[in-house]
């Protein structure tokens, strides 16, 4: 059994590490990976009452 | 829209093992996290764990020595073993899948298991 | 294991008034600028629907009468006005550290 990749991370870790391009940091273990591996929050309807979230999972130029 | 189903037996004697399926339409299960959580009797959740995109697997330690999930991405299924039960786990049993946060958006409609000789 | 104590364990509100839920988490769910903090509504015989995520972005298809607040370890759900189709139990749940876990739980009635 392998455990998550996060449960080595202490509270006091880096900012995120610049992805390559075409990659996506993975909040949810720390580290980049194809941005085609993760899934984002549903976009909301046109006219939704707040607007949509800033995502911090876009890919680094 | 993606959409989860669990499904698997409703009766389970005493340490014996729990399998579990979870089937995963309007997504593939190499993208993104796929989650089993149980609800108890009384009213409390609980993170079991996970599989990732990779087939990377999280487990939560109260749980490590006696579970496993696994994936088969042929089936576009991923699967739910808990080993040596008892009538603790006696529980509702929801495969889940998270979006960016780790905020689950889609849930299966639950499976009852009932742990009993 | 980050503790999520929610209060009040349960909680009857008139219809049209405002139902305030508190969640506090045993150390910061914060990272990156993230509060990995997330409510959720849960009926009988149903599964839990996502209503919050990251504190206080509104799921979609939620209705604007839902509201997230908070960072650190101090987060409130707030439902204004409440209707009737809101008696349920509602969860916090934080995704910050592993294992990610869950609040016990508010139970929302109608006074």
């Known amino acids: 059994m392998r455990r998550g990749p996060r449960s080595l991370r202490g509270r006091d870790a880096p900012a995120p590490t610049p992805c390559v391009p075409a990659e996506c940091f993975d909040l949810l273990v720390r580290h980049c990976v194809a941005c085609g591996a993760l899934r984002t929050p549903r976009p909301k309807p046109a006219g939704a009452s707040s607007p949509a979230p800033r995502t911090a999972l876009q890919p680094q130029e | 829209e993606v959409q989860l189903q669990e499904s698997g037996p409703s009766l389970v004697k005493p340490s014996q093992t729990l399998s579990l399926t979870c089937s995963v339409t309007g997504d593939s299960i190499t993208r993104g996290y796929w989650n089993w959580i149980r609800k108890f009797p009384g009213n409390k959740l609980e993170f079991m764990g996970y599989?990732?995109?990779?087939?990377?697997?999280y487990y939560n330690p109260s749980l490590k020595s006696r579970i496993s999930i696994t994936r088969d991405t042929s089936k576009n299924q991923y699967y739910l073993q808990l080993n040596s039960v008892t009538t603790e786990d006696t529980a509702t049993y929801y495969c889940?899948?998270?979006?960016?946060?780790?905020?689950?958006?889609?849930w299966g409609q639950g499976t009852t298991l009932t742990v009993s000789a | 294991d980050i503790v999520l104590t929610q209060s009040p364990v349960s909680l009857a509100v008139s219809l049209g008034q405002r139902a305030t839920i508190s969640c506090r988490a045993s150390e910061s769910v914060d990272d990156y600028g993230i509060s990995f903090m997330h409510w959720y509504q849960q009926k009988p015989g149903q599964p839990p629907k996502l209503l919050i995520y990251r504190a206080s972005d509104l799921e979609s298809g939620i209705p604007a009468r839902f509201s997230g607040s908070g960072s650190g370890t101090d987060f409130t759900l707030t439902i204004n006005p409440v209707e009737t189709d809101d008696v349920a139990i509602y969860y916090c749940?934080?995704?910050?550290?592993?294992?990610?876990?869950f609040g016990g739980g508010t139970k929302l009635e109608i006074k």
């Open positions: 749940q934080q995704t910050s550290k592993d294992p990610w876990t």
């Open positions: 599989i990732n995109y990779s087939g990377t697997t």
């Open positions: 889940a899948t998270p979006h960016t946060y780790g905020a689950m958006d889609y």
